[in-house]
């Protein structure tokens, strides 16, 4: 499966939008820093089949979409930027869903790579728990925005490595 050229452009646009969502200086939120234990091993491609990587990337983007489409994110972040971000993520999900169908078929995909998918879910569960504990403060959102930028960048790198292997 070849992801369209627009896919990598969409990735870049999504990252730019995340960067633009910054509302306060990260330096004013140093006390709120938190290690969410990003599941790095799920984004190291050494053991990956392509279909597995696509499934993990899809889960990563789906969870990012879910996180930023809550009423709490709308209250904390710029709605115009959020709307543009949703459009980019939605396109990414559509591209990856087409690929999942081609690579593994509709029946196998959810269960075959469940361990990797669950690692991503647990990571996002920790992020949502952190936001709840911090009462969705502006600093908490800044910490999370920076974290998602980092994890999103790592997932883009995995996509690039997949493309270079084709």
């Amino acid at each position: 499966c070849d992801l369209p050229q627009t896919h990598s452009l969409g990735n870049r646009r999504a990252l730019i939008l995340l960067a633009q969502m910054r509302r306060i200086s990260p330096f004013s939120c140093l006390k709120d820093r938190h290690d969410f234990e990003f599941p790095q091993e799920e984004f190291d491609d050494k053991q990956f089949q392509k279909a597995q990587a696509i499934s993990v990337l899809h889960e990563m983007i789906q969870q990012t979409f879910n996180l930023f489409s809550t009423k709490d994110s709308s209250a904390a972040l710029d709605e115009t930027l959020l709307d543009e971000f949703y459009i980019e993520l939605d396109q990414q999900l559509n591209d990856l869903e087409s690929c999942v169908m081609q690579e593994v078929g509709v029946i196998e995909s959810p269960l075959m790579y469940e361990d990797s998918i669950l690692a991503v879910r647990k990571y996002f569960q920790r992020i949502t728990l952190y936001l709840t504990e911090k009462k969705y403060s502006s600093c908490a959102w800044e910490v999370v925005r920076a974290e998602i930028m980092r994890s999103f960048s790592l997932s883009i790198n995995l996509q690039k490595r997949l493309k270079s292997k084709e």
Epitope: P39, Q62, A119, R121
Partner: antibody, heavy 122, light 107 residues
Amino acid sequence: EVQLVQAGAEVKAPGESLRISCKVSGYTFTSYWISWVRQIPGKGLEWMVKIDPRDSYTIYNPSFQGHVSISVDKSITTVYLQWSSLQASDTAIYYCVRHYLTQSLVDYFDHWGQGTLVAVSS
Amino acid sequence: DIQMTQSPSSLSASVGDSVTITCRASQSVSNYFHWYRQKPGKAPELLIYSASNLQTGVPSRFTGSGSGTECTLTITSLQPDDFATYYCQQTHGYPFTFGQGTKLDVR
């Protein structure tokens, strides 16, 4: 087949320490949260604590925090619940449970151990 | 803590009957409601998750519905195996909490 096999019943005196175990098999140990649930005989269910075996990240029910501790041994895919000083009120059946986590990040308990009865009496 | 209140606390019925158990949460838990059945002397088992999803292997006689602060478990065409205690649970907020249980016995 997913299995959570718990250690047998324990009879202890107040003030003694205890560690009960839950050996899991049939799935990738580090992929799922594990919790402990207490059931006082004839009473309802109380969630105590959960742990992510991947890195031992834990979340406690404040009602149990400081009185029990949870730990894992990844090498033998086993989760433990430990008391340093038992009280008569700890008499209960303790269940270990596996969590499933949906895409909308809903936890639910999809597999249960058979339970360990802990009796604390002088 | 989120309080979970089940009603009724006990219920008598006959094989073949239909019964409904209700669970109310002290605040909204969205669809983070789950139902378990506990047979005497056994560990609980999952029946319904996320308010309305039937766990694999559970007969379709069990149905769950609701969201927000209230959910229901309905069992149609009761079987001998169904006479047990039923618990609802919420996993929307920590600590996770269970209802006090509904004991279903033979009329």
